[in-house]
Structure formats: C-alpha cells, structure tokens
Amino acid sequence: TPWSLARPQGSCSLEGVEIKGGSFRLLQEGQALEYVCPSGFYPYPVQTRTCRSTGSWSTLKTQDQKTVRKAECRAIHCPRPHDFENGEYWPRSPYYNVSDEISFHCYDGYTLRGSANRTCQVNGRWSGQTAICDNGAGYCSNPGIPIGTRKVGSQYRLEDSVTYHCSRGLTLRGSQRRTCQEGGSWSGTEPSCQDSFMYDTPQEVAEAFLSSLTETIEGVDAEDGHGPGEQQKRKIVLDPSGSMNIYLVLDGSDSIGASNFTGAKKCLVNLIEKVASYGVKPRYGLVTYATYPKIWVKVSEADSSNADWVTKQLNEINYEDHKLKSGTNTKKALQAVYSMMSWPDDVPPEGWNRTRHVIILMTDGLHNMGGDPITVIDEIRDLLYIGKDRKNPREDYLDVYVFGVGPLVNQVNINALASKKDNEQHVFKVKDMENLEDVFYQMIDESQSLSLCGMVWEHRKGTDYHKQPWQAKISVIRPSKGHESCMGAVVSEYFVLTAAHCFTVDDKEHSIKVSVGGEKRDLEIEVVLFHPNYNINGKKEAGIPEFYDYDVALIKLKNKLKYGQTIRPICLPCTEGTTRALRLPPTTTCQQQKEELLPAQDIKALFVSEEEKKLTRKEVYIKNGDKKGSCERDAQYAPGYDKVKDISEVVTPRFLCTGGVSPYADPNTCRGDSGGPLIVHKRSRFIQVGVISWGVVDVCKNQKRQKQVPAHARDFHINLFQVLPWLKEKLQDEDLGFL
C-alpha cells in the first residue's frame, strides 16, 4: 500500500518541503505531494513524496539510496547509448543536454535502420527511432539497443532470444525478453528505460495508441489472415461472423480525483466516437472501480453496440459513486471484465473464438488492495486460449491498453498489465488529465484514417484547414479581365468538386489555380469536367440571361493529393464512406441516405466562407419542408429573373434553397464562396449535399458582408443527389464505393 488509507488528513507539516527552482502541489488531500519543475528540468531526487503515518514526509533518497537534504530542479539530460553494435555514434559524452544531437554511422557491410540523427528532447527522450546497424544476415533483423538499455544476446536465428536491462533507478517499459519468431518478427515490443520524470507527450501517445488501435479495428478481408509469422500489418479480421468487445475500465478511486475522473470520461467519449468513425460496431463493456468495481454496461446487453447509448451511460456516471469505498482494487475491476468475457456453464457459445477483446484501462497505477491484477490478465489469456498453441497463438484476440495518469503512476505495474506486440505500444504514461484529453483529440488525426471522408481535427490548437480539410481555393486568371475566385471541395485524391460557372470554355488549364490545405503552392490541373447538361446560355431566348441548372464541375488534378491533417476528402452522398460515417448498416441504400441527410423539413447545414483571410463556418438551414416553396419563389428577386413567369424555369429540381429569416436568419454566401460545399454535419462527420451556385442578393458588395439583408436574400445550391449518375461515372476509379 503506498500510504495508509485510514490516516487523518493533512498530518504532515509543509515546512522545509520546498524545492529549489520549482514548486510543489499537494495531492490526495495532503497525503502526497508532487514537485513541479519548469520545462526542461526535473525534480531531484524524487518527483513525489508521501506523508507517513509518523507525520513526516518520505525521505529524499537518490537512486543509489543516498539521502538528500533539499529537493532541487535539475536540468533534464537524455541517457547516453550504453552500447551501439556494428557502428559508431558521435559525439560521445557521459550525458546529453536538451537539444543536443547525436549521429550514428555503420561499419562497412552494415546498413543503418532507424534514425541516423537524434535530438535530446525536453522530456528526456531522444527523437526518432532506434538506430540499428544490420548486415541483413540474421533470420530476424537486429532488434537494436534502444538508447539507455543494455542488450544481452547477439544472434538472431529463429528462436534465439535477446534480453534487455536498464540501469539502476530506471524502469523498463516494454519487453525484457524478445524471441526471434517465424517470418522474421520479434516477439513482444521494443523496450525503453524510463525515469520517473518522463512522460509521453500527447502527440506520441496519440500516434502510438492509434496506430495500434487501428490495426485492431480496421477490418480486412477474412481471407487475409496470416499465420504466426505474420508480418503484414496486424489487422483484426472482422469477418461477418466475428465481433469485437471493447471494455472501458476507469479508475474512480481517491487517488484519481473528481476532475481527472471527468476528464477520463471525456476521453472515452472521444474514443467511442473515434471507433464508430471506422464503421465498426463493437460491443462495449463499461466498468468503474475503487475498492469495488461497478459494471455500468455489460457487453451482453442489447444496446452495448449502440455507440450513442453507451456514450449516454458513460456521461451519467458520477465520481461520487465510489466515494465511500475509495481504495484502488484493479484486480477486482479486471475480474469484472473476466466475468463479462466468460460464458455461463463454461460452455463456449458458437463463434467465441472469433471475438476480439480490447481492454482500455485508465488508472494512476496505484493498486493498493486486492492483490496483483496481472493474475487476472493471465486468467483472461487462458480463457481466450491465447499463447497456448504455437501454430495459432491468437495474440490478436486480446489487446490490453493501459493509460497511467499523473505523477504517482507505478510504471512497473502498468507495464506488466499492458500487451506487448511488435512495433506497437500498449502502455502510456501521461503527465495529467489535460494531456490525456489532448491525446484523444489528436486521435482524430492519424495516418490510418486519413482516407476516411468528412473527418476533421476539432482541436483547440487546430488551424482553419485542420477544421475544413476538404476546402479548396480556386482562382481563374483571365488576361485583361482580372480573375474569378471560387471554392471547391476535395472529394478524392485526384478530384476537386466545384461549380461549373467558375469557368468559361475559353479558360485554359494553366490559368486555373487550385490550392488546398492552406498551402501556398498551386496544384497542376489535368482537366476540368463540366456536367454535360450545364449551359449558362441555355435559356437566353426565353429571356433568362443566366441559367445555372447542373452547375457542377470536377477538377481533375495531375498529381495525387497527399492526405494529411489539413488535406482530406469530404463525404459524398451515396457512397460506402458516407454509410460508415453515418453509422448506417452496410446494406443502406442511396434512398435511405437521402432520407437521413435531406429529410422533408428544415435541415441544419453549413458552408465555409473566407472572411479576412480566415475560413469560417456559416450555419444555414436548407428549406426542404413547408418553407421550400417560399424559399424558391424568392428567386424572382434575383437580377434578371424579375420577368420570369414560372419560377421553376430557373429553380429546377436540381437546387437546394437556403437563406431568409425563418426558422433563423441565415447568413448568405458571397461571390467567392461559389463552388464550395453545402454540408450536413452529422455524427461528427461532414457530408457534402450541395454545391454553392448562385444567390438572389449580393450581400458582399465592397468586400464586406452586410449585416442587414432583406428576407428574400436566398442562396441556391446544386443538390448532389440529383447529379449522382455523373459523379459516379467521373469518379469511378476513385475507390469511393458508390452505392
């Protein structure tokens, strides 16, 4: 037990506990304290102290057990490489300061893998990947010696093992022993040596957790399973008869604290949302625990695969629920998970061996009662028949992720519980809950999901193009006529969707400039494809000067876009991506998508406009119910349409109508917004339903958007559901999976 639970509060004096060069804060209602140092410094000799039952604070002891009189903040150093095989590193030094660099070189006949140059970072870790000099002769590649570790074993034949050790006072994270397996992979995961002051940055955690999690949840064809020597990316095969259970286990003990508990709930809500965005529907189990566990959602419940319902249950959990019994019994919590996994009468149900299990544990890592929780992990492995059969070890069927939060985390404990898989990380230590919340925001942007449509990075640190990554800016330079500005939307790696009226037949490809992601450089255009039915002069004889029916065009780019945080596609109607985005069943039809996105009522939507060099979202309502007729009739107020007898001559069934003052006063589009997407935002995803075409009133004269606009100021947008055959034909090679 780290400290007595029964001791009266605040019985240790704060006299003389100060730290030179830093500050301290009390934890656990005064029963512990944490030393806090400025960035680039760490508390020496310890980061935390506990109030003993004798009324004195725990002694300041160094790693070699020497007593120190006063704590101080010391500059963070990065560890030096103890060994580097088959090469040299430079410069050599007993320690390295923050921002120092080292470079690695291999002897002749050896090739460098990993990072040739590494920089000492502010968290005491080296940037980049472990540098390894390998001659490629071994059955397995050289597993390397992560900086700060020592390796025993230098043969890499099939079934050879290597072991790793850390210097005194450092904790080994990852696998201490790794074995060369069939297919040339190493068992376990790369080790590292952690000092108590070291934390994972939110970016590191988001990247590592997500790259592992996506391997777990991104479905592949059932035929794609590989044997134990599997070196293709580890992916769980979600064949129709298989399933996935995710168990969310949340520490609600005293040591976590109420605000951290609330933060952890936020994180899990984001996680549920993230998983749903992949189009998979796992069953959830939800457990909170202190002295005893409490099961809030059982995987066996009918609604456990309904992400919205599970989120609701999670939001309703109260930290006070564990108030009276506030120890930390992680073992009991995992036993609750075991009970959900096991089957009645010990008779396995049909398909039990096709269910993948993911446990996500958030804790401060301080179990102080109930015994060692690792025994339950062993029981779970037994139950799921994992690691028993060499030919089919079934390791893919269980992933245990552990998030340790805060300064009191016991690194040994959390490392023991977490799964260890090659090239993956399952154990994380973050400084505080704010950092963990950052992680779950950053999860929205990981390379595995970059091709998912309509996803954005809604984070406080995000730029305009993080928030609107599909938005494209288009300008057409016309000699002696100035230039035309329009917007567009990235719909695939090669295509931008926009309005046809942005171009004339005389515009040459080289005079059309397209930029995405807020980048300065323009993209090269291969061709502009107009809808064949678009003809702006089509009704001139009938006294209609400009006719915008079928006002859509696709810009085909010469080079493939590289998706990233600020460049990714928007979802198009009647595609498989939109089915997944809306979390609809795979059998969903185009008509059902239409009913979901454009029901016969006022539909909340948005468009993106540029104001003072900033992209802003403008919320509007598509009038698709009883207000539709009056919205369309206001087209008569548009310049040149006042003589039109029948408004359906200009407002064809291809248009959606926004603007006006009911149900709310809608903002209007400006000239430069033309071609941009009209978007429905649903389930945290963005689906384009229209292309901005024309407006009744120019509300943006003199580059300023007027505040007061008449009630008849309406905007018209091409309804993408009405031009699907054309989109499907032109985008047939883009893997969008049109329904």
Partner: antibody, heavy 120, light 113 residues
C-alpha cells in the same frame, strides 16, 4: 574447412528404429544449429527439424513429432537423428546440414547423406 | 503449411541459352517490415547433396557464378541461368523458411537440349 561426415547406409525392418550420426569438423560445433533433411528415392527434399548443439534444444516438423529424436554429443562434435517405428515410406537418403552463424535457415554445408532402406 | 509449387517439372535448354525456373508459394513469404523474402534456391546434381545457390530470394551465395540470379517477391519467384553451361545440368529446388515447417518445391529437372 567445414566438413560434415555421416554414418553409413542402413537397412531396417518396418517398426524398427534407425540412428544416423553426423560428425562435424572445421568449426565450433556448438555455435551452429544442425538441421536434418531427407529425400526419398527420386523425390524432393523434406525438412525434418533441427537441434541447437549449444543448448540441446530441438524443433521438429509436425509430421515427425513423436517419432524423431535429435541429440548431440558436444565432446565429439557429433549430432544424431533417430527415427523410430520405421515404415517403408521412410526409405530415403537422410542429410545433416548446417546453416550460417547468423541464420540457420540457409543450408550452406551438407553431409554426404545416409541411405536408410526400410524393407521387410 | 506453405506449399511451394515449381514450374516446369522439367526443362531442356540449349547450351548458352537462358533457362528460367518459376516457384510459387501458397502464401506470401515477404516480411513487409524488413522487405525480405524468406526464400532460397538449391541445386542438386545426381548422387550429391544439394548446394545453396541463392538466399533472400535474390542474394547469390559466395562462389556461385553470376550467371545464376534470383528474382521475385511475395508469392512468385524466378531462378534464371543467363547462359546455360554443361555443368548446370541438375535438379533445382526452391525453399521457403517464412513459416515452420520449412518446405521445398517438388524440384525442376534441367537438361541440355
């Protein structure tokens, strides 16, 4: 020079056992796995398993599990392969082979082979 | 088990001509992390043990003439003898070591036309 010298040909009755030896010279015997491969008359090659002479650890192909035993005597740098409950389809040339220090999977050195005939 | 299938079963080529032997594995033997194919080629002359020619699908064993080359990746591999010599008459085997048990192809007999 690396040499692997195998014992002479054997004729056995069905149900009997045979023990083939492979004496290594010209290198450090315990540093390299010894692998056994067989070849039935006019047929292809078949991997049987290996022994790590350093630890005595073995790995057998599933097909031979329970019938094959690989052992070694480090004092005389010799590896042995014993196959029990012989059947007529065990008639084959049995080879010992040695891989590289770094990778036992590439059989760079071979014994001359031992013909085992199983016949009633 | 991974099944290795060679084609053709036998091949007759004139001296000085190119000989090509194919080998197909029932599943990929490429490790996508280290980009290596766990495949080797052996040559066996009558009455002799096999001899290692190529490993990692394309690395020539030392002492093997450079007229022998290996290529391919994943599931499809080729052994090429650029200019056939009389001493190349033999049976050639491919072998995978990606998964246990290690398995050989059935062999391709190369003769002179």
């Amino acid at each position: 020079e690396v040499q692997l010298v195998q014992s002479g040909a054997e004729v056995k009755k069905p149900g009997a056992s045979v023990k083939v030896s492979c004496k290594a010279s010209g290198y450090s015997f315990t540093d390299y796995y010894m692998t056994w491969v067989r070849q039935a008359p006019g047929q292809g090659l078949e991997w049987m398993g290996w022994i790590n002479p350093n630890s005595g650890g073995t790995k057998y192909a599933q097909k031979f599990q329970g019938r094959v035993t690989m052992t070694r005597d480090t004092s005389i740098s010799t590896a042995y392969m014993e196959l029990s409950r012989l059947r007529s389809d065990d008639t084959a040339v049995y080879y010992c082979a040695r891989g590289y220090y770094a990778n036992s999977a590439w059989f760079a050195y071979w014994g001359q082979g031992t013909l085992v005939t199983v016949s009633s | 088990d991974i099944v290795m299938t060679q084609s053709p079963d036998s091949l007759a080529v004139s001296l000085g001509e190119r000989a090509t032997i194919n080998c197909k594995s029932s599943q990929s033997v490429l490790n996508s992390r280290n980009k290596k194919n766990y495949l080797a080629w052996y040559q066996q002359k009558p009455g002799q043990p096999p001899k290692l020619l190529i490993y990692w699908a394309s690395t020539r064993e030392s002492g093997v003439p450079d007229r022998f080359s290996g290529s391919g990746s994943g599931t499809d591999f080729t052994l090429t003898i650029s200019s056939l010599q009389a001493e190349d008459v033999a049976v050639y085997y491919c072998k995978q070591v990606y998964n246990l048990p290690w398995t050989f192809g059935q062999g391709t007999k190369l003769e002179i036309k």
